[in-house]
């Protein structure tokens, strides 16, 4: 089992949309697998895949899962907040037939304020 | 480019074990996503899968062979190994080394082959 | 384990000519949930390895001439070429990876007629 995880860099003005995408690649067939979306080491959704379905589809605040075949799971972000930033991680393992897992690489997610003032703001509040 | 090329004794007494090396060159194998397999040709030109390990030292078997193979890597020297106990004539055939991605499941770079006859 | 059956065993095609080989799976080799058939086939040149033609079914390698072609779902499986040339004289197999153990057919032998 193979997980490759992109962008590793991804700077987005908050109220848009981030697109975290995780490619999960096995070279047999399998008939369940367990996916996960961690945020600074916090689970946002754990849902599997079976017979081609996701069992959720909602991953975090305002995040979409989607799953399309043959191995890309997508993570969307929609409407972006200022919290949302930090780093994401992609986990995935194969439960069925026998167990085998991987994870992708940090996305690191960085949202920029919608006001530039605000920008200002919080630059400056930083101690001298 | 990666080449795989398989190296050991061509005969092989029976009851006895068959041993032998594949050297990988051009590519780690211990890169993510790979696997690196033993199969074998027989007389017969039938293919038999035997084993494989994978990227992170897993392995799995021929059920078939299973009680009789061992396959094992060393990666300071890019070698994975295969070692077959108990050999009788069935056991003579043309082994190869190959590799297989996750990602591209087929057995894209095949080693030559080498020829194991087991005789007495 | 699954049983990979191929026919014929051998064929003998006129240059020029179409030259078809099937394969038949005991099990069904696709999956819904990556939308793929697990099934390669591989060509043998005497004294040489086999080298990869058509995997998940229908996809040709890059480098593989377009004639030839993969086709088929579930349990089975063609590979045609579609205008057989002097140097497609060679033994042709099967092979899935639906699961482990990998298992291949005993292969079809291709001749000139």
């Known amino acids: 089992l193979s997980v490759q995880q992109g962008p590793n860099l991804l700077q987005v003005r908050q109220g848009s949309q981030a697109t975290l995408v995780c490619q999960v690649d096995q070279a047999t067939a399998w008939e369940r697998l367990r996916v996960k979306w961690t945020k600074d080491g916090a689970i946002l959704c754990q849902p599997y895949i079976t017979n081609g379905s996701l069992s959720l589809g909602v991953c975090g605040p305002q995040g979409r899962l989607s799953w399309q075949a043959p191995s890309h799971l997508t993570l969307q972000l929609d409407p972006v907040s200022l919290n949302h930033s930090g780093a994401y991680v992609c986990w995935a393992a194969v439960e069925i037939p026998e167990l085998e897992e991987a994870e992708g690489n940090i996305t690191r997610l960085f949202v920029d304020p919608d006001d530039p003032t605000q920008n200002r703001n919080r630059i400056a509040s930083f101690p001298g | 480019q990666v080449q795989l090329q398989e190296s050991g004794p061509g005969l092989v007494k029976p009851s006895q074990t068959l041993s032998l090396t594949c050297t990988v060159s051009?590519?780690?194998?211990?890169?993510?996503?790979?696997?690196w397999s033993w199969i074998r040709q027989h007389p017969g030109k039938r293919l038999e899968w035997i084993g494989y390990?994978?990227?992170?030292?897993?392995?799995s078997y021929n059920p078939s062979l299973k009680s009789r193979v061992t396959i094992s890597r060393d990666t300071s020297k890019n070698q994975f190994s295969l070692k077959l106990s108990s050999v009788t004539a069935a056991d003579t055939a043309v082994y190869c080394c190959?590799?297989?991605?996750?990602?591209?499941?087929?057995?894209?770079?095949w080693g030559q082959g080498t020829m194991v006859t087991v005789s007495s | 384990d699954i049983v990979m059956t191929q026919s014929p065993d051998s064929l003998a095609v006129s240059l020029g000519e179409r030259a078809t080989i099937n394969c038949k799976s005991s099990?069904?080799?696709?999956?819904?949930?990556?939308?793929?058939?697990?099934l390669n086939w591989y060509q043998q040149k005497p004294g040489q390895s086999p080298k990869l033609l058509i995997y998940?079914?229908?996809t040709r390698l890059s480098g593989v001439p377009d004639r030839f072609s993969g086709s088929g779902s579930g349990t089975d499986f063609t590979l045609t070429i579609s205008s057989l040339q002097a140097e497609d004289v060679a033994d042709y197999y099967c092979?899935?990876?639906?699961?482990?153990?990998?298992?291949f057919g005993d292969g079809t032998k291709l001749e000139i007629k």
């Open positions: 190959a590799t297989m991605a996750d990602r591209f499941a087929f057995f894209d770079v």
């Open positions: 998940h079914a229908s």
């Open positions: 051009g590519f780690s194998i211990s890169t993510s996503g790979y696997y």
């Open positions: 390990i994978n990227y992170g030292g897993g392995t």
């Open positions: 092979q899935h990876h639906y699961e482990t153990p990998l298992t």
């Open positions: 099990q069904s080799l696709f999956s819904s949930n990556t939308n793929r058939n697990y």
